[in-house]
Amino acid sequence: FGISGKHFITVTTFTSAGNIGEDGTLSCTFEPDIKLNGIVIQWLKEGIKGLVHEFKEGKDDLSQQHEMFRGRTAVFADQVVVGNASLRLKNVQLTDAGTYTCYIRTSKGKGNANLEYKTGAFSMPEINVDYNASSESLRCEAPRWFPQPTVAWASQVDQGANFSEVSNTSFELNSENVTMKVVSVLYNVTINNTYSCMIENDIAKATGDIKVTDSEVKRRSQLQLLNSG
């Protein structure tokens, strides 16, 4: 006994991104302490008076919570004793972006760490053969992106080729007037080739691949968050 709170404990955060309209997680870990009642977790946001979230004595204390986070925050209560102070954020808003501080106090000491939280919209692209077109075309669609991304096409056979002259990309604002639907059409495609549609903004990069042969169509999609970790 005797030196509670006098030592610094290691707190680790990871830069992350939130997909607006969906649930997000702000990651934070700390040196575990089996005494749950002695753990205090405070989440703060730069430029915001009041707390984002406070968890102490084994439960939420939202008496000082800022209004913009009301009803939308929670910690993983059953994982606090093993050092998880991550914050769940319900229905991520564009305005949730910013610098957050995860502050921890335990019987071993206290510590804090900052994280940058980016918000935007990102979704998997889907590529289909556009049979309605006059020539063989591929249509790449992704339902939700923000900020406006760049779209590029590539092909396995014509590596390094510039497809901007033979493709057409449009951005259609979604009903909530923030995110946009991305549609890109690639014309004059050849059979027995693999084409990739790459969509990227400063938050995420998504790729859709399609291989068209005489007998089948194979698809694959992947999405990667940028600058995370």
Epitope: R70, G71, R72, T73, A74, V75, F76, A77
Partner: antibody, heavy 121, light 107 residues
Framework: QVQLQQSGAELMKPGASVKMSCKAT????????IEWVKQRPGHGLEWIGE????????TYNAKFKVKATFTADTSSNTAYMQLSSLTSEDSAVYFC??????????????WGQGTSLTVSS | QAVVTQESALTTSPGDTVTLTCRSS?????????ANWVQEKPDHLFTGLIG???NRVPGVPARFSGSLIGDKAALTITGAQTEDEAMYFC?????????FGGGTKLE
């Protein structure tokens, strides 16, 4: 104690709009989400969406994005759902429910008694 | 959209233990699905029982418990009582929307 009191049954004509209400008493209205749920015989329960009173934050089931609009008035502790361009498919009982989002749990606890909507010419 | 599947009906006797399950078409149910269980009695009387997989709603009797069993969410009634005869719905959260199961009629 906590109560969610919904407005009475409605009989509407196809193509019309209807606005139903859900009055909350016994708790801090702005601290809980209000969920809207549709029940049709043989179709079980269908989630329409949710609103966090006191904010403009809503989430809609994609299927109901054009059909439903949620609002909430914190001065009267009342949530509203408007359904537009009504068809016979909209005939159902509609429920509001309180949803708590917090570290200790995430639950629907209290439900309204339901508003019955019949769409018929 | 995901499909959530429940047993359509189960029969039990007073004092018995009965388990209702909730399966997701997208794979294993996890704690991130915040599994909820809701009871419906005649005349559209709904009551929340369990939230966040295993947390009892305040005021709900201790005989009701929630858990994950294998890849499914489960509601267990330990020592069922006659008043537990009702419809039970599970609801799973998929990051930005809820999906309800078809319900289990417990007799």
């Amino acid at each position: 104690q906590v109560q969610l009191q919904q407005s009475g049954a409605e009989l509407m004509k196809p193509g019309a709009s209807v606005k139903m209400s859900c009055k909350a008493t016994g708790y801090t209205f702005s601290s809980y989400w209000i969920e809207w749920v549709k029940q049709r015989p043989g179709h079980g329960l269908e989630w329409i969406g949710e609103i966090l009173p006191g904010t403009s934050i809503t989430t809609y089931n994609a299927k109901f994005k054009v059909k439903a609009t949620f609002t909430a008035d914190t001065s009267s502790n009342t949530a509203y759902m408007q359904l537009s361009s009504l068809t016979s498919e909209d005939s159902a009982v509609y429920f509001c429910a309180r949803y708590y989002f917090g570290s200790s749990s995430f639950y629907f606890d209290y439900w309204g008694q339901g508003t019955s909507l019949t769409v018929s010419s | 959209q995901a499909v959530v599947t429940q047993e359509s009906a189960l029969t039990t006797s007073p004092g018995d233990t009965v388990t209702l399950t909730c399966r997701s078409s997208t794979g294993a149910v996890t704690t991130s699905n915040y599994a909820n269980w809701v009871q419906e009695k005649p005349d559209h009387l709904f009551t929340g029982l369990i939230g966040g997989t295993n947390n009892r709603v305040p005021g709900v009797p201790a005989r009701f418990s929630g858990s994950l069993i294998g890849d499914k969410a489960a509601l267990t009634i330990t020592g069922a009582q006659t008043e537990d005869e009702a419809m039970y719905f599970c609801a799973l959260w998929y990051n930005n929307h809820w999906v309800f199961g078809g319900g289990t009629k417990l007799e």
